[in-house]
């Protein structure tokens, strides 16, 4: 065509893929007739017509855009649909009259590519690796034209660097006439990359400009051998027996190499190896004073058999010992004095404190109880508490009973109970005193004793409610070297007008499941009659 | 094309050590990695070792101390041994390729039966 | 180590039927996933990698879908060659591999 070499730069349009691409013929009426045009792709520098308008109608030759053009702004501008990446490529239109002319459109064609997809090395890299290794790869689907990749690590951007960063990429043309852009990061690793944050980002162009996704970011396994080996026990802080221990050894190499406890043995100074659970942790549970001792840890590295030592840790397991108290079982006449003495033996200092075993109140702080004209009422239990300070919960604990002599002590002197005849009736009578007492009845029963501690005893009796028992009542009797006692119980047969609700009497009802002349499991329950304490 | 082909011995004693050669064919060692999958008899696959394109050797944990692979890129050759053989390791034996710009194995030898009996 | 739970672990169909078969990880494994076809006597055959990516020279009827824990594959027409035990792979962190899922002639 004559002066094609001076033709100008064609126009650019710039369209994404699937939407409509508006083709604007640009000759002016001078150049020709927009009423008669002829539209022409080209592609490899072979025209094609395409679309013909003439009296300012159009239409559409045979051929792959047959169904997709069609005339806008009054026969100026040819429509594109549906445009596909295989569209780019030149349009020309040309005007017939008064002479040919010709104008060239460009066509620009774009497509965002899906979010990239990254995939880490799922076996991991070591960081000892001869040449780089993959460490992750890319990929971006169906962008066009060929998106660019930046691999980033901790938010930097990597360069290829000789035998210590590589990427490759490589793209697939799919059916679609779109790109699938495949990228691999190799790097050599070092053990700080074990967190290093690795991601790929996709630069693209839209007819907007310019644009860019990111891949997830990915962390890669990162091996590397140990240098250091540790132990940590938990709890931390100061241990005492009965408590779980754990006994963790550590590494800083990945994977975690084999480990094995050992604890010295003072007498052989020999380290004996200790047996862990499946993770390499020794339990001490619970723990014991003798756990205490030197422990140390060695890590076996299984494809070198190398093997590293921890600094020792010496482990101690706070105790307090058994609690002697003396004397063990002191006894002494009213009025006289004693002296309580408390020892144990413990890894930290100790502190002691007496208490009375029946209201816990402390008597005295110091190993040392000293008491003084001793009353009847000071025989009982006393309690020596040996306890650490610095450490809570570790203390033990020592009884001691004191008894102090002297004759039968009843727990009531005379009680009324009320009855019904022919009932079987569980009575019962308590006293103390050292030594400690017995107890008999004045009337024929079924009897049992029980001790309720070394010095006071407890009666019970069953018998049946006879007219004769209600006359004489019922008497119990203790007796020691010391002297003897007695406590009566008065039988009183219950009638409707011993039990008015606004009665003022406090005595009780002896209840009984049983009927006249049956001597079944029945029982009677007594409540005490208000009077003054008899103490015998 | 790519192929890939295991071969080694069809029977093995008991504390016998088994030793299997993939030669491939179509690609370089140096460009894909290779893997040894087993599939015991109407069970399912197993991974069991690979080495890189790189050359660094990755094993399963389950068989750690036993396992040992190797290359020799000249030959075109991955050498899988695997000692101390028992008869639950009577299985069928794969080596795989991994795919370039992936970590899935896109081509398969036809596998080799190996069976562990006295 | 990540588990994979296939289900159902086998199942019968008949040609032209759409089939789903199940893949649960133990753990996020995002979408390191690959399915394999296996015929008796033969080795496995990639289908979809990356839970959703057809493998070139795979049918348009085999889809991946899902991402994290779990995945599905499906076959949306079946045909008599597609008859054969198909297993799930992730490779997020090591290899491990599915049950299996045997597909059978109704």
């Known amino acids: 065509v004559p002066g094609e070499a001076e033709q100008p730069a064609p126009e650019l349009v710039e369209v994404e893929v699937g939407s409509t691409a508006l083709l604007k013929c640009g000759l002016s009426q001078s150049q020709g007739n927009l009423s008669h045009v002829d539209w022409f792709s080209v592609h490899k520098e072979k025209r094609t017509l395409i679309f013909r308008v003439r009296q300012g109608q159009g239409q559409s030759e045979p051929g792959e855009y047959e169904q997709r053009l069609s005339l806008q702004d009054r026969g100026a501008t040819l429509a594109l649909t549906q445009v596909t990446p295989q569209d780019e490529r030149i349009f020309l239109c040309q005007g017939k009259r008064p002479r040919s002319q010709e104008y060239r459109i460009q066509l620009r064609v774009y497509k965002a590519p899906e979010e990239p997809n990254i995939q880490v090395n799922p076996l991991g890299i070591p960081v000892n690796s001869k040449e780089p290794e993959e460490v992750a790869t890319c990929v971006g689907r169906n962008g066009y034209p060929i998106p660019q990749v930046i691999w980033y690590k901790n938010g930097r951007p990597l360069k290829e660097e000789k035998n210590r960063v590589h990427i490759q990429s490589s793209q697939t043309v799919e059916s679609s006439g779109l790109y699938t852009l495949q990228s691999i990061l190799k790097a050599q690793l070092v053990k700080e990359d074990k967190d290093a944050q690795f991601y790929c980002e996709l630069n693209y162009r839209l007819p907007s400009g310019n644009h860019m996704k990111e891949s997830r970011e990915v962390t890669v396994p990162v091996f590397y051998p140990t240098e250091k080996v540790w132990l940590e026990v938990e709890p931390v802080g100061m241990l005492k027996e009965g408590d779980r221990v754990e006994i963790r050894c550590l590494a800083d190499g990945n994977p975690p190499p084999h480990f094995s406890i050992s604890k010295g043995n003072p007498s052989t100074r020999e380290a004996e190896e200790e047996t862990t659970n499946d993770n390499g942790v020794l339990v001490l549970e619970p723990a014991r004073k003798e756990h205490s001792g030197r422990y140390e840890c060695q890590a076996w590295n299984l494809d070198t058999m190398i093997s590293l030592l921890s600094e020792p840790q010496e482990l101690l397991v706070n105790y307090v010992s058994d609690v002697r108290v003396s004397p063990a079982a002191p006894e002494r006449q009213e009025g006289s004095s004693l002296t309580l003495t408390c020892e144990a033996e413990s890894s930290q200092d100790l502190e002691f404190q007496w208490l009375r075993e029946e209201t816990d109140q402390v008597l005295e702080r110091g190993p040392v109880l000293q008491l003084h004209d001793l009353k009847r009422e000071a025989g009982g239990g006393y309690r020596c508490v040996a306890s650490v300070p610095s450490i809570p919960g570790l203390n033990r604990t020592q009884l001691v009973k004191l008894a102090i002599f002297g004759p039968p002590w009843m727990a009531f002197k005379e009680r009324k109970v009320w009855v019904k005849e022919n009932m079987v009736l569980n009575l019962s009578c308590e006293a103390s005193g050292h030594p400690r007492p017995t107890i008999s009845w004045n009337v024929n029963g079924t009897a049992s004793e029980g001790d309720q501690d070394p010095q006071r005893v407890l009666s019970t009796l069953n018998v049946l409610v006879t007219p004769e028992l209600l006359e004489t009542g019922v008497e119990c009797t203790a007796s020691n070297d010391l002297g003897k006692n007695t406590s009566i119980l008065f039988l009183e047969l219950v009638n409707l007008t011993t039990l008015t609700p606004d009665s003022n009497t406090t005595t009780g009802l002896s209840t009984s499941t049983a009927s006249p002349h049956t001597r079944a499991n029945s029982t009677s329950t007594e409540r005490k009659l208000p009077e003054p304490e008899s103490r015998g | 094309q790519v192929t890939l082909k295991e071969s080694g011995p069809v029977l093995v004693k008991p504390t016998e050590t088994l030793t299997l050669t993939c030669t491939v064919s179509g690609f370089s060692l140096t460009s894909n990695g290779v893997s040894w999958v087993r599939q015991p008899p109407g069970k399912a696959l197993e991974w069991i070792a690979a080495?890189?394109?790189?050359?660094?050797?990755y094993y399963n944990s389950a068989f750690k101390s036993r396992l040992t692979i190797s290359r020799d890129t000249s030959k075109s050759q991955v050498v899988l041994t695997m000692t101390n053989m028992d008869p639950v390791d009577t299985a069928t034996y794969y080596c795989a390729r991994r795919y370039g710009y992936g970590w899935y194995f896109d081509f398969w030898g036809q596998g080799t039966l190996v069976t562990v009996s006295s | 180590d990540i588990q994979m739970t296939q289900s159902p672990s086998s199942l019968s169909a008949s040609v032209g039927d759409r089939v789903t078969i199940n893949c649960k990880a133990s753990?996020?494994?995002?979408?390191?996933l690959a399915w394999y076809q296996q015929k008796p006597g033969k080795a496995p055959k990639v289908l979809i990698f990356n839970a959703n990516s057809l493998q070139t020279g795979i049918p348009s009827r085999f889809s991946g879908s899902g991402s994290g824990t779990d995945f599905t594959l499906t076959i949306s027409s079946l045909q008599p060659e597609d008859f054969a035990t198909y297993y799930c792979?992730?490779?997020?962190?090591?290899?491990?591999f599915g049950q299996g899922t045997k597909l059978e002639i109704k």
């Open positions: 080495i890189s394109s790189g050359g660094t050797t």
């Open positions: 753990q996020n494994i995002y979408n390191s």
């Open positions: 792979q992730q490779f997020y962190s090591g290899y491990t």
